[in-house]
Amino acid sequence: MKVLQEPTCVSDYMSISTCEWKMNGPTNCSTELRLLYQLVFLLSEAHTCIPENNGGAGCVCHLLMDDVVSADNYTLDLWAGQQLLWKGSFKPSEHVKPRAPGNLTVHTNVSDTLLLTWSNPYPPDNYLYNHLTYAVNIWSENDPADFRIYNVTYLEPSLRIAASTLKSGISYRARVRAWAQCYNTTWSEWSPSTKWHNSYREPFEQ
């Protein structure tokens, strides 16, 4: 049994880091393998992650972490029984993938303005809370070409757009994702999409 693709990990910079790797053949990840991880810090304890299958030869492990900060560095040991298959390290702050925003809501009762709001996925005491920027994707269910991205570079998790910038009388969907420049993160996954019917009063022709 050998590792074909070494583990690569990303952290949500809050409580979970996800590591994925590939074996050289079909593997029952949960019964045959264990990923041991330990913070390189005084008094830290070793933890064991039981991987799950991710395709025939692929494995994925969700590492639980407390109080993640930029100085943290973890040692990783991948074991198959008594055999050490791979040894490495992981610094969560250098491989951050933020959590996806939640509770995306479209408020259509503001006069001819669409107000989209969502929730910041981090608590106020997490560093990323004040450092997320967002991308909002809006698309038409009727017209695949009607697809747009709005970059939200301010901190407030909301976006206002004139309803007239979208076609009236048809249904739209929206979703939002986040990233943080400070840690050069990747983009988060998209939030679940939300749907609304866009309608607004056309201005009277003179």
Epitope: F41, L42, L43, S44, E45, D66, D67, V69, A71, D125
Partner: antibody
Framework: QVQLVQSGAEVKKPGASVKVSCKAS????????MHWARQAPGQGLEWVGI????????SYAQKFQGRVTMTRDTSTSTVYMELSSLRSGDTAVYYC?????????WGKGTLVTVSS | QAVLTQPPSVSAAPGQKVTISCSGG????????VSWYQRLPGAAPKLLIY???KRPSGIPDRFSGSKSGTSATLAITGLQTGDEADYYC????????????FGTGTKLTVL
């Protein structure tokens, strides 16, 4: 919100021991290390030691080795710092502080006076 | 236990800028991150800066930190009378096991 509530002031005689408590609330107690530091009158801050509330393991500043003992009670989310063989130089305000590499939140402090 | 060196006192007028230095060595500041704490009269210390230059939520951006080599600096702009306090730098040292030295402390007076 996070609160670290420390026990009240103590007056002790030289050679005696003192046990200071720090009750934590507002966060997952076993997820954060707890430091102890002190400040003697007219002096700066001085680190005493650290405890991992999850397993109870501890590490102390060399200066206090053999005289200090840190323990925790997970059922009450409380950490304790006991200092023995007290001398006048141990008169100080003792603080518990939550954190790992740095101290996010501090208790209000417990004044320990050592006097004959 | 290693101690980090700070100036005993600094002073400036309201609205001005002041800097406080913190000098250490290769086994602490040079190899770690620096934090800064404010201790107002009669109060417990409060975290101002961590990770060399990050502010906890609620700390105004008048406070900033930087690090270069084995030294660190806390800068306070737009001084207010409420900033009058003792300031301490802190880090960790792994030269003889892990220890957390603090700076000698700096008394800031707002004139």
């Amino acid at each position: 919100q996070v609160q670290l509530v420390q026990s009240g002031a103590e007056v002790k005689k030289p050679g005696a021991s003192v046990k200071v408590s720090c009750k934590a609330s507002g966060y997952a107690f076993t997820s954060y290390y707890m430091h102890w530091a002190r400040q003697a009158p007219g002096q700066g801050l001085e680190w005493v030691g650290i405890i991992n509330p999850s397993g109870g393991s501890t590490s102390y500043a060399q200066k206090f080795q053999g005289r200090v003992t840190m323990t925790r009670d997970t059922s009450t989310s409380t950490v304790y710092m006991e200092l023995s063989s007290l001398r006048s130089g141990d008169t100080a305000v003792y603080y518990c502080a939550r954190g790992k590499y740095w101290m996010y939140d501090w208790g209000k402090g417990t004044l320990v006076t050592v006097s004959s | 236990q290693a101690v980090l060196t700070q100036p005993p006192s600094v002073s400036a007028a309201p609205g001005q800028k002041v800097t406080i230095s913190c000098s250490g060595g290769s086994s602490n500041i040079g190899n770690s991150y620096v934090s800064w704490y404010q201790r107002l009269p009669g109060a417990a210390p409060k975290l101002l800066i961590y990770d060399n230059n990050k502010r906890p939520s609620g700390i105004p951006d008048r406070f900033s930190g930087s690090k270069s080599g084995t030294s660190a600096t806390l800068a306070i702009t737009g001084l207010q009378t409420g900033d009058e306090a003792d300031y301490y730098c802190g880090t960790w040292d792994t030269s003889t096991g892990w220890e957390w030295p603090f700076g000698t402390g700096t008394k800031l007076t707002v004139l």
